[in-house]
Interface confidence: low
């Protein structure tokens, strides 16, 4: 499991706002935000990135294809760029994950999963804003 504590959160936020968010919204276009309830949450920035990484790249029983989508490719590039040593840990993780996944499908859940991802990214941005506000208050 990669430890996201040493990532450059500001740079990741910039990448998210510039491109990843648009790709996620494009993927969800035509789907109302009220269609799905957000059940996945995160409490701090590293935790949010852990959950984002898991939901984006680990095939689940009801959604196996997200990793090849544009937003996933950009997420991977962003994490590789701004999280030291992330790329190296992912090579082994991918191999292990391929071996253990189980994908019996009755109902597709990809849109629900991307809806959860949008929620996690928003939470990541919010925790970042909170940190910046705290930092701002300490200096005044």
């Amino acid at each position: 499991m990669y430890d996201f504590t040493n990532c450059d959160f500001q740079k990741i936020e910039a990448d998210y706002l510039r491109t990843i968010s648009k790709d996620l919204i494009t993927y969800m276009s035509g789907t109302k935000s009220t269609d799905f309830n957000n059940t996945v949450s995160c409490s701090n920035r590293p935790h949010c990135l852990t959950e984002i990484q898991s939901l984006t790249f680990n095939p689940t029983p009801r959604c196996a294809s997200l990793a090849k989508e544009m937003f996933a490719r950009k997420t991977k590039a962003t994490l590789a760029l701004w999280c030291p040593g992330y790329s190296e840990t992912q090579i082994n993780a991918t191999q292990a994950m391929k071996k253990r996944r189980k994908r019996k499908v009755t109902t597709n859940k990809c849109l629900e999963q991307v809806s959860q991802l949008l929620g996690l990214w928003r939470r990541f941005i919010r925790t970042l804003l909170k940190k910046q506000l705290e930092h701002h208050h300490h200096h005044h």
Epitope: G30, P59, K68, K102, R103, V105, N108, C110, L111
Partner: antibody
Framework: QVQLVQSGAEVKKPGASVKVSCKAS????????MHWVRQAPGQGLEWMGV????????TYNQKFKGRVTMTRDTSTSTVYMELSSLRSEDTAVYYC??????????WGQGTLVTVSS | DIQMTQSPSSLSASVGDRVTITCRPT??????LAWYQQKPGKSPKLLIY???TLAEGVPSRFSGSGSGTDFTLTISSLQPEDFATYYC?????????FGGGTKVEIK
């Protein structure tokens, strides 16, 4: 590049069985499900079932339950679809097609199965 | 099972025309819809999935829209190679089902 190569055309008598093969290449065989879809002459497409090559887990269309069996051989990256108790209305082109989430990005060339007495 | 009603079943059009095909599932499938093109004697070819995502290598004149129970495939400017039969298919859950097809013929 991704290729799904199916076995050749078959002519069968009513009541017999047919086994169609589909050999996959150009990707990791166990990563994608393999579905079977058939098309009767001049008709639309009909989903028959799916096999997960990683563990042979299958889900069949209720319509074909008891008559269809899907298997796989990971050593040759081949999936098989066997249909038993054939009747004339089973005359169709049978396609194997790969998928991750229910939409089909690559298809085999099709295998014509003719059921005739 | 979810039934897919496609219309029209056939249409005649000329090169350069804008063509619209609709697909209506019997229940809400959100955006879990794919479109395929099939030419005589050939296997179907994926055009669009998740209602509007263009498959790799598919020309941008093809576009998909809609969600829930109303979907549309649009060919903005029909080309000679586009004369074929088009099928919609829901990929929401088992059993995956297809529409009856729309044959696009030369006027």
């Amino acid at each position: 590049q991704v290729q799904l190569v199916q076995s050749g055309a078959e002519v069968k008598k009513p009541g017999a069985s047919v086994k169609v093969s589909c050999k996959a290449s150009g990707y990791t065989f166990t990563t994608y499900w393999m579905h079977w879809v058939r098309q009767a002459p001049g008709q639309g497409l009909e989903w028959m079932g799916v096999i997960d090559p990683s563990d042979s887990d299958t889900t069949y269309n209720q319509k074909f339950k008891g008559r269809v069996t899907m298997t796989r051989d990971t050593s040759t990256s081949t999936v098989y679809m066997e249909l038993s108790s054939l009747r004339s209305e089973d005359t169709a082109v049978y396609y194997c097609t790969r998928s991750l989430d229910g939409y089909y990005d690559y298809w085999g060339q099709g295998t014509l199965v003719t059921v005739s007495s | 099972d979810i039934q897919m009603t496609q219309s029209p079943s056939s249409l005649s059009a000329s090169v350069g025309d804008r063509v619209t095909i609709t697909c209506r599932p019997t229940e809400n499938i959100y955006s879990y819809l794919a479109w395929y093109q099939q030419k005589p004697g050939k296997s179907p070819k994926l055009l669009i999935y998740f209602a509007r995502t263009l498959a790799e290598g598919v020309p941008s004149r093809f576009s998909g829209s809609g969600s829930g129970t109303d979907f549309t495939l649009t060919i903005s400017s029909l080309q000679p190679e586009d004369f074929a039969t088009y099928y919609c298919q829901h990929h929401y859950g088992t059993p995956w089902t297809f529409g009856g097809g729309t044959k696009v013929e030369i006027k």
